[in-house]
């Protein structure tokens, strides 16, 4: 992967892709967030490893996204969950699990869910059980939103940078 | 279909969309493949058929994506599973269904997974099944990297253009 | 699109300057349409409230999203089902959900299903249950299309701006 | 550049119908629908429908649905308005329009006035 | 089908007076509204879309604005050759529909 065991700044410099020489007409602003796989019972995301990056004025904050500047963004994200059979001394409950992507603006004293998947899992007998959700819109967002993601179920979140991300990029 | 029922070549033309007839400043990369129906038990895909094509640099190499340029660009892929019950004089055992989008770069000796969907499905008594999994991201790519899936169920895929897909568009 | 409704000397000069602001330079045809929660039994789509939008010339027409211009669009939609456990006495019959984007024009006959997914629910008894499907994929296009979706399960509709979307952009 | 016009208007019997033409001329013609707006003396203006002519694509205001049919034909660049059962009401002078995107009416023909009296 | 209402149906107005037509649409119609310009015997044409945009050509004196169901075209400094029939349109839903037009006249 790029910048595997190298220095963080030198793995930063290892993933600058090569970019087409022209004077920069359009920034796209663009962000793609991968699940830190050693924060095992909380759900922190990063930008300075593997294939995740932040692009033309996207910044993390506070575990959050901000938007760079207004106008339209695809914004996206997936989780998988995994958990094993429960044991037979152990009593079954459903579990419930979900995952939303909200949007925290000046203009709202809340977070407001911009994206949700949700599902009931019913853990059996020497059952593993395995499952992914995600989702995508395009939303029309302003300069200083913040994105940040809300999910239940942490404690079974299968973290690689293949399975839990979040991101975004201007329309 | 645009071209149903034309012999290929026909059919091609009949699926050129109209453009702006503009030059073309900006050259917009973009692919969509469909699961080749007539392959049972594989996940061939193919760009010259019903709604799937390639434009702008896209070609497909190898069952791969190859990336005409580099940047980054959002890669999306979906399958749908589906499964009959088993038979009463048969065991039930646990099927593990899976997609992964994988990078293969001459940087790396190996695929890289992108994006990766998994589940478990416990086939039960006259329980059909049927299960659908997407996933999309952005994704710094350079030029000649190749873009393929990896199926863990395959003689269980729905093969249709709707249900069985994999794309890639530059942003 | 660019210079779109400039006259072609226009255009280039326009292209040759990005930052130039001439109107119609970078039009970016986009829509996110929400399922109506005041209509129980049918999806409705609405771009009026919430976070929905129509902008750069998309279009409703019979519930359906009108394609501004010709080209390559992303297309997606997203619904999450819910169930209450069926009641002891009733008998429980296996539900068969499904969600599809579909596009028509009345080149052909039929609605040509674009994007599919589908799933098997067996309510058990005391389990209440949860689904979410999504699906998005690149498409070309052409002016006047008309773009729609297709549900079975509609009753089970978890009817809420972040759950049921339906939404398309220009590439 | 851009050029629509329209040919075929004139007086009508109520009941009979009428079938427009509209040239167009400076474009692909395949890139862009054409639509049929009419405009009753003194009046407003009213959408009819439109059509494409890259695919034959069409869509009616519930209104004319039935009486109305827009067609085309590419190997002649033109659009055609046939409207049945006319009567009085449907007096109107008849435009084509080419849209850049497909709500916005950027391009107009000159007009032709159909009346329809006995 | 959305009902666009205008208003005044007719003003008068001098050579560089700031001139105000307002548009009501019976249901919110986000921002998916387009004016149009029409002078005696000629088609109309296209003056503004997307609610605020300015349409190629068309002098910087007019401007659109609002959302929802509430919107207005605004010439700032009427000329000698603004005056004519103004229409606004919804492109919300189809059948699109029109208002009844404001006619600016000469004082």
């Known amino acids: 992967l790029p910048g595997v065991g190298l220095t963080p700044s030198a793995a930063q410099t290892a993933r600058q892709h090569p970019k087409m020489h022209l004077a920069h007409s359009t920034l796209k602003p663009a962000a793609h967030l991968i699940g830190d796989p050693s924060k095992q019972n909380s759900l922190l995301w990063r930008a300075n490893t593997d294939r995740a990056f932040l692009q033309d004025g996207f910044s993390l904050s506070n575990n959050s996204l901000l938007v760079p500047t207004s106008g339209i963004y695809f914004v996206y994200s997936q989780v998988v969950f995994s958990g094993k059979a429960y044991s037979p001394k152990a009593t079954s409950s459903p579990l419930y699990l979900a995952h939303e992507v909200q949007l925290f603006s000046s203009q709202y004293p809340f977070h407001v869910p911009l994206l949700s998947s949700q599902k009931m899992v019913y853990p059996g007998l020497q059952e593993p059980w395995l499952h992914s959700m995600y989702h995508g819109a395009a939303f029309q967002l302003t300069q200083g939103d913040q994105l940040s993601t809300h999910t239940d179920g942490i404690p079974h979140l299968v973290l690689s940078p293949s399975t839990v991300f979040f991101g975004a990029f201007a329309l | 279909l645009p071209g149903v029922g034309l012999t290929p070549s026909a059919a091609q033309t009949a699926r050129q969309h109209p453009k702006m007839h503009l030059a073309h400043s900006t050259l917009k990369p973009a692919a969509h493949l469909i699961g080749d129906p007539s392959k049972q038990n594989s996940l061939l895909w193919r760009a010259n058929t019903d709604r799937a094509f390639l434009q702008d640099g896209f070609s497909l190499s190898n069952n791969s994506l190859l990336v005409p340029t580099s940047g980054i660009y959002f890669v999306y892929s979906q399958v749908v599973f589906s499964g009959k019950a088993y038979s009463p004089k048969a065991t039930s055992s646990p099927l593990y269904l899976a997609h992964e989008v994988q990078l293969f770069s001459s940087q790396y000796p190996f695929h890289v997974p992108l994006l990766s969907s998994q589940k478990m499905v416990y086939p039960g008594l006259q329980e059909p099944w049927l299960h659908s999994m997407y996933h999309g991201a952005a994704f710094q790519l350079t030029q000649g990297d190749q873009l393929s899936t990896h199926t863990d169920g395959i003689p269980h895929l729905v093969l249709s253009p709707s249900t069985v897909f994999f794309g890639a568009f530059a942003l | 699109l660019p210079g779109v409704g400039l006259t072609p000397s226009a255009a280039q000069t326009a292209r040759q300057h990005p930052k130039m602001h001439l109107a119609h330079s970078t039009l970016k045809p986009a829509a996110h349409l929400i399922g109506d929660p005041s209509k129980q039994n049918s999806l409705l789509w609405r771009a009026n409230t919430d976070r929905a939008f129509l902008q750069d010339g998309f279009s409703l027409s019979n519930n359906s999203l009108l394609v501004p211009t010709s080209g390559i669009y992303f297309v997606y939609s997203q619904v999450v089902f819910s169930g209450k456990a069926y009641s002891p006495k009733a008998t429980s019959s296996p539900l068969y959900l499904a969600h599809e984007v579909q596009l028509f024009s009345s080149q052909y006959p039929f609605h040509v299903p674009l994007l599919s997914s589908q799933k098997m629910v067996y309510p058990g008894l005391q389990e209440p249950w949860l689904h979410s499907m999504y699906h998005g994929a690149a498409f070309q296009l052409t002016q006047g299309d008309q773009l729609s979706t297709h549900t079975d399960g509609i009753p089970h509709l978890v009817l809420s701006p972040s759950t049921v979307f339906f939404g398309a952009f220009a590439l | 550049e851009v050029q629509l016009v329209e040919s075929g208007g004139g007086l009508v019997q109520p009941g009979g119908s009428l079938r427009l033409s509209c040239a167009a001329s400076?474009?692909?013609?395949?890139?862009?629908?054409i639509h049929w707006v009419r405009q009753a003396p003194g009046k407003g203006l009213e959408w009819v429908g439109y059509?494409?002519?890259?695919?034959?694509?069409?869509n009616y205001n519930e209104k004319f649905k039935g009486r109305a049919t827009i067609s085309s034909d590419k190997s002649k660049n033109t659009a055609y308005l046939q409207m049945n059962s006319l009567r009085a009401e449907d007096t109107a002078v008849y435009y084509c329009?080419?849209?850049?995107?497909?709500?916005?009416?950027?391009?107009w023909g000159q007009g032709t006035l159909v009346t329809v009296s006995s | 089908d959305i009902q666009m209402t205008q208003s005044p149906s007719s003003l008068s107005a001098s050579v560089g007076d700031r001139v105000t037509i307002t548009c009501r649409a019976s249901q919110a119609v986000s921002s998916a509204v387009a004016w149009y310009q029409q002078k005696p015997g000629k088609a109309p044409k296209l003056q503004i879309y997307s609610a605020s945009h300015r349409y190629t050509g068309v002098p910087s004196r007019f401007s659109g604005s609002g959302s929802g169901t509430d919107f207005t075209l605004t010439i700032s400094s009427l000329q000698p050759e603004d005056f004519a029939t103004y229409y606004c349109q919804e492109n919300y839903s189809t059948p699109w529909t029109f208002g009844q037009g404001t006619k600016v006249e000469i004082k």
């Open positions: 059509n494409n002519p890259y695919n034959d694509g069409t």
């Open positions: 400076g474009y692909t013609f395949t890139s862009y629908v």
């Open positions: 329009s080419r849209p850049t995107m497909l709500p916005w009416f950027a391009y």
